[in-house]
Interface confidence: low
């Protein structure tokens, strides 16, 4: 079938259109184009005879049409009047006619639109603004853009006049945006330049910054005022109702208490004619004095004296604060505060109470700290310690002993041998000692301030023969899989070798066994019941050797899971039930029984004579080791059958 396709269908003025013929028959005489939907000689555009290849213009020919051999018609420089239908009349060689009609539409190329406004300076919450997209164009669609986005849905936005007018009712400051309009038709789309809506608003209630309202005498007062406003607000300051200046900032240097009062910022918008004010109350405080601490006892004695620290000066209606070691006061029954917090009393001072102590006076703005105070607590002397710890020496060596006792002020030391004063020094030195130097060596420490003395006595043995050693232990009853045990071979002697034996054998290699302190100490980690053996230590030097008595390690363990015997679980009615419970444990455990959950007796053996089927049930043995704090249990089911029936059979 003969058809006409318009390319394009929508044509812009000034452009061209091709009426393209499809399914053109063969063996043609010629064809002719007409304006309109039918063949009308008065509206013929052009005719074409194939044989002569001659084109003949018709009455409707405008000079802008070109006909092609394939019957397609090109129309150039399209004008608005070209819109409509075009009919192709084909005359075949047998002079049979065939017709086809096509059409196209012509649209103007749109100009760049512009936006006109009925109000260039609308006032917020009062005015409406109507934007109109210019010029008015037929067959054009109008679109609007706000900040390059399509229009939001809002009851305050209204399109009218075929979308050509955009009205914003009751404008707000948020409507300050870039507005564009766009015109569209099938052949073009043009967007206007943006129009910025300048909404007059405010001033809002001004904000005064900074927010703090309390100042110290001598500081600078610098207040700044800001109110959201378009155009920007004009600012005025009033102090206690009296106008000061028309600036956004108010600066008063070196303020005094007299500058206290109400400070008002007024913001004025000359375009909206509105004023808004905000008031802040400023309080200026006099500078308080720096506090200091006085003490009723500058040299208190430990565990004897109390100390009262007082924060000076005394000021009415003032809050006093205290700090110890830069921390707030700890909760302690030895610390007492007076009702006004001004006095801090330390009851029965200790050497740890030295401080430093600080007090503070709190005013409305800040806290003023005193300088720190340190207490000189007199203490000691504690029991002196004599070093080194050796008690056995060989003849011919030098004996050098040193004494130390914690004390404030530092202790004065004296040495006595067998009760006789030797010298008033911290160290005692005797060269080339002999057996005659054996004896009781006493160190006496004296605190001259407190008048207290403490002594320590050490027995020194000078002998070529080593004494018989002994074993001391840090844990006489260790718990299995929990405790460690450290054996130490005594005494500590110079130039001596220490040896160890377990059950008469030298020490086995084990990660749980560790020698330290010159082999003088043997540590067993994570003891087990197998470690309950005889331990012996030996000492030797170049002259002699000696061995300790054995020490047997008593390892607490268990109770292990108990065993109930006999193992039988089926009994005949009338038999005696005699159950015995046993659990490996050191010390021996306490036993108790429960039948069907009900406590029975606290014995190792449970005996029930002449049992019946009523004695069926669960029999539980509970074991408890009070030394290890551990418990264990086992449950056994007992079945009693009536006489004459075997277990597992029914009559």
């Amino acid at each position: 079938k003969l058809t006409i396709e318009s390319t394009p269908f929508n044509v812009a003025e000034g452009k061209e259109v091709l009426l393209l013929v499809h399914n053109l028959p063969q063996h043609l005489f010629g064809y002719s184009w007409y304006k309109g939907e039918r063949v009308d000689g008065n509206r013929q555009i052009i005719g074409y005879v194939i044989g002569t290849q001659q084109a003949t213009p018709g009455p409707a020919y405008s000079g802008r049409e070109i006909i092609y051999p394939n019957a397609s018609l090109l129309i150039q420089n399209i004008i608005q009047n070209d819109t409509g239908f075009y009919t192709l009349h084909v005359i075949k060689s047998d002079l049979v006619n065939e017709e086809a009609t096509g059409q196209f539409r012509v649209y103007p190329e749109l100009p760049k639109p512009s936006i006109s406004s009925n109000n260039s300076k609308p006032v917020e919450d009062k005015d409406a603004v109507a934007f109109t997209c210019e010029p008015e164009t037929q067959d054009a669609t109008y679109l609007w853009w706000v900040n390059n986005q399509s229009l939001p849905v809002s009851p305050r936005l209204q399109l009218s006049n075929g979308n050509r007018t955009l009205t914003l009712f009751n404008v707000t400051r948020n409507d300050t945006a870039s507005y564009k309009c766009e015109t569209q038709n099938p052949v073009s789309a043009r967007r206007s330049d943006s129009v910025i809506l300048n909404v007059l608003y405010g001033p809002d209630a001004p904000t005064i910054s900074p927010l703090n309202t309390s100042y110290r005498s001598g500081e600078n007062l610098n207040l700044s005022c800001h109110a959201a406003s378009n155009p920007p607000a004009q600012y005025s300051w009033f102090v206690n109702g009296t106008f000061q200046q028309s600036t956004q900032e108010l600066f008063i240097p070196n303020i005094t208490v007299n500058n206290s009062g109400s400070y008002t910022c007024q913001a004025h918008n000359s375009d909206t004619g509105l004023n808004r004010t905000t008031v802040t109350t400023i309080t200026v405080y006099a500078e308080p004095p720096k506090p200091f601490i006085t003490s009723n006892n500058s040299n208190p004695v430990e565990d004897e004296d109390a100390v009262a620290l007082t924060c000076e000066p005394e000021i009415q209606n003032t809050t006093y604060l205290w700090w110890v070691n830069n921390q707030s006061l700890p909760v302690s029954p030895r610390l007492q505060l007076s009702n006004d917090n001004r006095t801090l009393t330390l009851l029965s001072v200790t050497r740890n109470d030295v401080g430093p102590y600080e007090c503070g006076i709190q005013n409305e703005l800040s806290v003023d700290h005193s300088d720190p105070v340190i207490l000189n607590v007199l203490y000691g002397p504690d029991d002196p310690t004599i070093s080194p710890s050796y008690t056995y020496y060989r003849p011919g060596v030098n004996l050098s002993l040193s004494c130390h006792a914690a004390s404030n002020p530092p202790a004065q030391y004296s040495w006595l041998i067998d009760g006789n004063i030797q010298q008033h020094t911290q160290e005692l030195f005797i060269s080339n000692i002999t057996e005659k130097n054996s004896g009781l060596y006493t160190c006496q420490a004296n605190n001259s301030a407190s008048g207290h003395s403490r002594t320590t006595v050490k027995t020194i043995t000078v002998s070529a023969e080593l004494p018989k050693p002994s074993i001391s232990s840090n844990n006489s009853k260790p718990v299995e899989d929990k405790d460690a045990v450290a054996f130490t071979c005594e005494p500590e002697a110079q130039n001596t070798t220490y040896l160890w034996w377990v059950n008469g054998q030298s020490l086995p290699v084990s990660p749980r066994l560790q020698l330290s302190n010159g082999n003088r100490t043997l540590t067993l980690f994570n003891v087990t019941r197998n470690d309950a053996r005889a331990y012996v230590c030996g000492i030797q030097n170049s002259v002699s050797a000696n061995r300790s008595d054995p020490v047997t390690l008593d390892v607490l363990y268990g109770p292990d899971t108990p065993i109930i015997s006999p193992p039988d679980s089926s009994y005949l009615s009338g038999a005696n039930l005699n159950l015995s419970c046993h659990s490996a444990s050191n010390p021996s455990p306490q036993y108790s029984w429960r039948i069907n959950g009900i406590p029975q007796q606290h014995t190792q053996v449970l005996f029930i004579a002449k049992i019946t089927p009523n004695n069926n049930g669960t029999y539980a043995c509970f074991v408890s080791n009070l030394a290890t704090g551990r418990n264990n249990s086992i449950v056994k089911s007992i079945t009693v059958s009536a006489s004459g029936t075997s277990p597992g059979l029914s009559a």
């Epitope: 760049k112 639109p113 512009s114 006109s116 009925n118 260039s120 300076k121 210019e134 010029p135 375009d271």
Partner: antibody, heavy 121, light 111 residues
């Protein structure tokens, strides 16, 4: 209705300054621009510059830049044009005219009556 | 700046005749396809009076015999039938861009 009343005629010496006022009524001058145009005797119209009374922003023809100052007082709805360093060729009638969407649809629909400034030694 | 050239400088016609005044801009004064060109009439001793704004719109109170046309750079003021009070000087002005320039004027005088 829109009215523009200009100050009276002035005779000035060369080198001095003149300040012409233009009081507006019937509209808010903050909604418009105020323009100044002058016309020398027997000559055509010459645009001098304009001001936006809402913010005080002004714009001048380069020829007058540095000699002309246009101001506005929104509280009295009055615009001013001050021309300094006067010379004889500044003898002209000076007009004020509002310009903007509200009042004149982007043309000069209303004019002051004009102020004749004569510069003569 | 945009230079406006008016022609003719003087036009001598009789009442009742048709007057055509031309104003040519050195560059387009169109904004969004609308010519921002205006026509003013001035009589001796008077301030200018707006006749036509934006190329073709009659100002308030202007008789219908005054019409304007044109776009881009070429604009025409037409007075269809001259009345005695129409004899005056006519100026065109562009407000497309600063500075807002005027043409040098066309004097319409009685023949």
């Amino acid at each position: 209705q829109v009215q523009l009343v200009q100050s009276g005629a002035e005779v000035k010496k060369p080198g001095s300054s003149v300040k012409v006022s233009c009081k507006a009524s019937g509209f808010n001058i903050k909604d418009t621009y105020m323009h100044w145009v002058r016309q020398a005797p027997g000559q055509g119209l010459e645009w001098m510059g304009r001001i936006d009374p809402a913010n005080g922003n002004s714009k001048y023809v380069p020829k007058f830049q540095g000699r002309v100052t246009i101001t506005a007082d929104t509280s009295t709805s009055t615009a001013y044009m001050e021309l300094s360093s006067l010379r004889s060729e500044d003898t002209a009638v000076y007009y004020c005219a509002p310009f903007g969407y509200y009042v004149s649809d982007y043309a000069m629909a209303y004019w002051g009556q004009g102020t004749l400034v004569t510069v003569s030694s | 700046e945009i230079v406006l050239t008016q022609s003719p400088a003087t036009l001598s016609l009789s009442p009742g005749e048709r007057a055509t005044l031309s104003c040519r801009a050195g560059e387009s004064v169109d904004i969004f396809g609308v010519g921002f060109l205006h026509w003013y009439q001035q009589k001796p001793g008077q301030a200018p009076r707006l006749l036509i704004y934006r190329a073709s719109n009659r100002a308030t109170g202007i008789p219908a015999r005054f019409s304007g046309s044109g776009s881009g750079t070429d604009f025409t003021l037409t007075i269809s039938s001259l009345e005695p009070e129409d004899f005056a000087v006519y100026y065109c002005q562009q407000t497309n861009e600063d500075p807002y320039t005027f043409g040098q004027g066309t004097k319409l005088e009685i023949k």
